[in-house]
Amino acid sequence: EEELQVIQPDKSVSVAAGESAILHCTVTSLIPVGPIQWFRGAGPARELIYNQKEGHFPRVTTVSESTKRENMDFSISISNITPADAGTYYCVKFRKGSPDTEFKSGAGTELSVRAK
């Protein structure tokens, strides 16, 4: 298969309000060169959740768990989840350029929020 895959293994994740949500994403290659970003929702109105290179994302931390040779971990954890955080989260690979262009997206992980 040509180039890389973006793998979001969890179709859905359910988290209690006030807890942290871990959103898993692995990528099979660094090539093409370019950043990974996380979004909630799709299309032009999507919301940027995390971009390592720039921006301030106080509730997001990176979670690198995979030591496998065949992929690299770009998972994140979002703390203090509220009902407003519900939605589908996408891990997106960009190709470096001026500007960077979207290359491939994961299938998405739907986050649902349970009452405490």
Partner: antibody, heavy 118, light 112 residues
Framework: EVQLVESGGGLVKPGGSLRLSCAAS????????MSWVRQTPGKGLEWVAT????????YYPSSVKGRFTLSRDNAKNSLYLQMNSLRAEDTAVYYC???????????WGQGTTVTVSS | DIVLTQSPASLAVSLGERATISCRAS??????????MHWYQQKPGQPPKLLIY???NLESGVPDRFSGSGSRTDFTLTINPLQAEDVATYYC??????????FGGGTKVEIK
């Protein structure tokens, strides 16, 4: 067993051209990112070029960009480096290297020597 | 460019003792908590051989006396205990998403 065998090195005058080849076996070549890395006694190891598994994307450092062209033929399990406008500072041992993820250089060939001299 | 500075340039260690090599990057090589720093061993007349990938992962077939640690800008390769066959030059290499990818200048390990 993974094998990478480089060929095509030799003595060339400044301004001349050479084409290096790397024949791969023992792994699924079309799934791997491939690169060339060179080594000189003075400058140590230097990354020279990288190509994506399908051949769509290529990357070069500024020291060779515009002079070197990397290509691959997945049907022949082969990697090629076309080197033009060669300079004395291109003199080095050139290694072919494979990478499953485009991250580390997992396997290396034995190298082929390029000498640029008048 | 990200500059990798290895220290020391050469190291003499007694058999059975610990050898420690440092690699410092001019800027972080971490992406999402993963450090894109790798270590290679090169013996005279041979190509480099991958030992450690992504800072701390031991390549298949490499003896567990080799270990790697560190994050962001500071990394260490440790050989413990040092064996005679470990005499070689060791290189660090970064492959973050900022081109060009670069190598350290190498550390030559010898037996004291």
């Amino acid at each position: 067993e993974v094998q990478l065998v480089e060929s095509g090195g030799g003595l060339v005058k400044p301004g001349g051209s050479l084409r290096l080849s790397c024949a791969a076996s023992g792994f699924t070549f079309s799934s791997y990112v491939m690169s060339w890395v060179r080594q000189t006694p003075g400058k140590g190891l230097e990354w020279v070029a990288t190509i994506s598994s399908g051949g769509t994307y290529t990357y070069y450092p500024s020291s060779v960009k515009g002079r070197f062209t990397l290509s691959r033929d997945n049907a022949k399990n082969s990697l090629y480096l076309q080197m033009n406008s060669l300079r004395a500072e291109d003199t080095a041992v050139y290694y072919c290297a494979s990478s499953l993820t485009g991250s580390s250089f997992d396997y290396w060939g034995q190298g082929t020597t390029v000498t640029v001299s008048s | 460019d990200i500059v990798l500075t290895q220290s020391p340039a050469s190291l003499a260690v007694s058999l059975g003792e610990r050898a420690t090599i440092s690699c410092r990057a001019s800027e972080s090589v971490d992406l999402y908590g993963t450090s894109f720093m790798h270590w290679y061993q090169q013996k005279p007349g041979q190509p480099p051989k991958l030992l450690i990938y992504r800072a701390s992962n031991l390549e298949s077939g490499v003896p567990d006396r080799f270990s790697g640690s560190g994050s962001r800008t500071d990394f260490t390769l440790t050989i413990n205990p040092l064996q005679a066959e470990d005499v070689a030059t060791y290189y660090c290499h970064q492959s973050s998403d900022e081109l060009p990818w670069t190598f350290g200048g190498g550390t030559k390990v010898e037996i004291k």
